[in-house]
């Protein structure tokens, strides 16, 4: 079966939207009205990976772009990046682990844990207009909870 994907936008628990900041970075900020059109649309693909009770492995691509969120070590620290891929080969069922996130969905709140680096989560800062990053703490200052809005294909 082909990989099933859905199109969606994500907002953090403070209702900040995610937008492109340069070619390979996302940032989070509050948007209103027509500015909402700036927010990135993700193609969330359901991929094969380790599953546990409340975790569903997904890959997060940018819709109609050959870019995927991935987790790599930079200066010995797990880091979130946007990585360019060959669109002929992606998405695929068995994505490389750096592209895989464990989607944890409880009461309409979502967390995205890195499969490559357990207990590291896609995070945003409390401050406006800051990069989306991979954070190693949950429940602290940084925000790891998101809501998902479906976008029709």
């Amino acid at each position: 079966a082909p990989v099933r994907s859905l199109n969606c936008t994500l907002r953090d628990s403070q209702q900040k939207s995610l937008v492109m900041s340069g070619p390979y970075e996302l940032k989070a900020l509050h948007l209103q009205g027509q500015d909402m059109e700036q927010q990135v649309v993700f193609s969330m693909s359901f991929v094969q990976g380790e599953e546990s009770n409340d975790k569903i492995p997904v890959a997060l691509g940018l819709k109609e772009k050959n870019l995927y969120l991935s987790c790599v070590l930079k200066d010995d620290k797990p880091t979130l990046q946007l990585e360019s891929v060959d669109p002929k080969n992606y998405p695929k069922k068995k994505m490389e682990k750096r592209f895989v996130f464990n989607k944890i969905e409880i009461n309409n709140k979502l967390e995205f844990e890195s499969a490559q680096f357990p207990n590291w989560y896609i995070s945003t800062s409390q401050a406006e207009n800051m990069p989306v990053f991979l954070g190693g703490t949950k429940g602290g200052q940084d925000i790891t909870d998101f809501t998902m809005q479906f976008v029709s294909s």
């Epitope: 079966a1 969330m44 991929v47 094969q48 599953e51 009770n53 569903i56 069922k93 998902m148």
Partner: antibody, heavy 120, light 111 residues
């Protein structure tokens, strides 16, 4: 803790319609990537997949029984219902519901099953 | 007749290793994940292996799965009497647009 429980009549007459309910807890069928399925097993025989419903209300049926089966969900009640029309003695089986997840498409948690006998 | 083909039965002595084969086609095993289930007598099936070779939570590492082309196999090492059960392989089938099961293999632990 994820659990699923099947309920429905133990005995149905030939030509009647069977209605089975799967009541689950510990997960939500509104969670993207979740599915619930029905599978049956006639006495002494192999497992046979019947129907699937996913978080987005997409429905899938086994080809041989497609015209007789209807699957539906009530997300607020955490229930999935299967109806099977025109029951026949060969439909006598243990009927299971199970959770499935997109990705592996594995039935990771099963109910205990309910035995349905078709006899006049 | 089942879409996936398994031997009806296998038997082996305690503490030995046994493998159960599962043969399919390009529309199922060839292009989709293989999952294995154990069904103890009178019980509901239980997931053992998913995504070809990943061990389900709480399952003994005496169980392992592998896949090559359109065939898969389940291996059980250090056989114990409590392993006596029916074992089923399954995979999504793209042609049928749904999951398919093997006919099941009855494992007997001798002695």
């Amino acid at each position: 803790q994820v659990t699923l429980r099947e309920s429905g009549p133990a005995l149905v007459k030939p030509t009647q319609t069977l209605t089975l309910t799967c009541t689950f807890s510990g997960f939500s069928l509104s969670t993207s990537g979740m599915w619930v399925s029905w599978i049956r097993q006639p006495p002494g025989k192999a497992l046979e997949w019947l129907a699937l419903i996913d978080w987005g209300d997409d429905k899938y049926y086994t080809t041989s029984l497609k015209t007789r089966l209807t699957i539906s969900k009530d997300t607020s009640k955490n229930q999935v219902v299967l109806t099977m029309t025109n029951m026949d003695p060969v439909d006598t089986a243990t009927y299971y519901c199970a959770r499935m997840r997109e990705g592996s498409r594995a039935f990771d948690i099963w109910g205990q099953g309910t035995v349905v006998t078709v006899s006049s | 007749q089942s879409v996936l083909t398994q031997p009806p039965s296998v038997s082996e002595a305690p503490r030995q290793r046994v493998t159960i084969s599962c043969s399919g086609s390009s529309s199922n095993i060839g292009d989709n994940a293989v999952n294995w289930y154990q069904q103890l007598p009178g019980k509901a099936p239980k997931l053992l292996i998913y995504n070809d070779d990943l061990l389900s939570s709480g399952v003994s590492d005496r169980f392992s799965g592998s896949k090559s082309g359109t065939s898969a196999s389940l291996a059980i090492s250090g056989l114990q009497s409590e392993d006596e059960a029916d074992y089923y392989c399954a995979a999504w089938d793209d042609s049928l647009n749904g999951p398919v099961f093997g006919g099941g293999t009855k494992l007997t632990v001798l002695g």
